[in-house]
């Protein structure tokens, strides 16, 4: 079983309702909002987490230049439609019949339209650039120590296979983490880079999705790494389709 047996909780997702009603009295957990059963040994999909959040009561230069096709999540929170596997449906609509297409991390990648809008496939986000600014410290972090700690964080806390952390760049106070995962690279059971990035984003904001009231304890050689700003860029396998009107606005 995958939930903590003793008090029947979901270690990897606090936005669940758990009860010992699984096979053999085992602990089983369901996501708030959708009621879908979740695997508590791994991360819950971003789509189910967003749905749960909406149902909850109403929180030499080495730096990479994001591509012209990079998306930033400017639309904020919405109540998404998820498929039976917990992934985002390619087309999302609101209560007023305004629809748009999203990528695999749920970020809008087309202009908004009406119910006639077609989204033929869910386009995969294969490259995520996490851009952080850390709070002032006595000195710069050692780059190799920082690199090793962040890779370990993604491997141990977010269960992301090390091969998907493509690079860690550092120019004090800016840290950039590059995650890359093509459709062909992602095997069954692999954590999706979009889910790992979302858990990391919530951790950094002090809104941890893991069980308990506590938060992230991230240190490099004993020095706390505290982030004061985060920007996340998403690159899709197929470039987004926005009208020129939006691009010149």
């Amino acid at each position: 079983h995958t939930a903590a047996q003793d008090n029947c909780t979901c270690p990897t997702n606090k936005m669940t309702v758990c009860s010992p009603d699984g096979p053999g009295g085992r602990c089983q957990c369901r996501a708030l909002g959708s009621g879908m059963a979740v695997d508590c040994s791994t991360l819950t999909s971003k789509c189910l987490l967003l749905k749960a959040r909406m149902s909850a009561p109403k929180n030499a230069r080495t730096l990479v230049r994001p591509s012209e096709h990079a998306l930033v999540d400017n639309d904020g929170l919405y109540d998404p439609d998820c498929d039976p596997e917990g992934r985002f449906k390619a087309r999302q609509c609101n209560q007023t019949s305004v629809c748009w297409c999203v990528n695999s991390v749920g970020v809008r990648r087309t202009d908004k339209g009406d119910l006639s809008l077609r989204c033929d496939e869910l386009v995969r986000t294969h490259h995520i650039l996490i851009d952080l600014r850390h709070r002032p410290t006595a000195g710069a972090f050692n780059h190799s120590d920082l690199d090793a700690e962040l890779r370990r964080l993604f491997r141990e806390r977010y269960r992301l296979h090390p091969k998907f952390v493509a690079a860690v760049h550092y120019e004090q106070p800016t840290i950039q983490i590059e995650l890359r995962q093509n459709t062909s690279q992602k095997a069954a059971g692999d954590v999706d880079i979009g889910d790992a990035a979302y858990y990391f984003e919530r951790d950094i904001k002090g809104e941890s999705l893991f069980q308990g009231r506590g938060g992230l304890d991230l240190r490099v050689r004993g020095e706390p790494l505290q982030v004061e700003r985060t920007l996340i860029y998403y690159l899709d396998e197929i470039p987004p389709k926005f009208s020129m009107k939006r691009l010149t606005a």
Partner: nanobody
Framework: QVQLLESGGGLVQPGGSLRLSCAAS????????MGWFRQPPGKEREFAAT????????YYADFVKGRFTISRDNSKNTVYLQMNSLRAEDTAVYYC????????????????WGKGTLVTVSS
């Protein structure tokens, strides 16, 4: 799968000392906060002490302050509870617990549990 194995429990006289150990195996717990809880006979399980993964922060319940000390050895994936000045009311099953990696040492974040070791304080 996560496994936590406690040892060091036993019978001790009032005023005596014991040192409990808990070895973590399965997933790496060098970056997990760890803690000790206890369940006295016929009572609910209660928090005793926690320690951050770096060992730089500890947190104790009022009833153990000044008597119990939590520590850890990350090279051995082991956490300890040194218990001094033991009293009859310390009699309980003592459970080791661990958080998700990189979680802080808040007791509410402890999600993985050992099976417990019995400590009996009696003359």
């Amino acid at each position: 799968q996560v496994q936590l194995l406690e040892s060091g429990g036993g019978l001790v006289q009032p005023g005596g000392s014991l040192r409990l150990s808990c070895a973590a195996s399965g997933r790496t717990f060098g970056r997990a906060a760890m803690g000790w809880f206890r369940q006295p006979p016929g009572k609910e399980r209660e928090f005793a002490a926690t320690i951050s993964w770096s060992g730089s922060n500890t947190y104790y319940a009022d009833f153990v302050k000044g008597r119990f000390t939590i520590s850890r050895d990350n090279s051995k994936n082991t956490v300890y509870l040194q218990m001094n000045s033991l009293r009859a009311e310390d009699t309980a099953v003592y459970y080791c617990a661990a958080s998700e990696p990189y979680s802080d040492y808040d007791p509410s974040g402890m999600v993985y549990w050992g099976k417990g070791t019995l400590v009996t304080v009696s003359s």
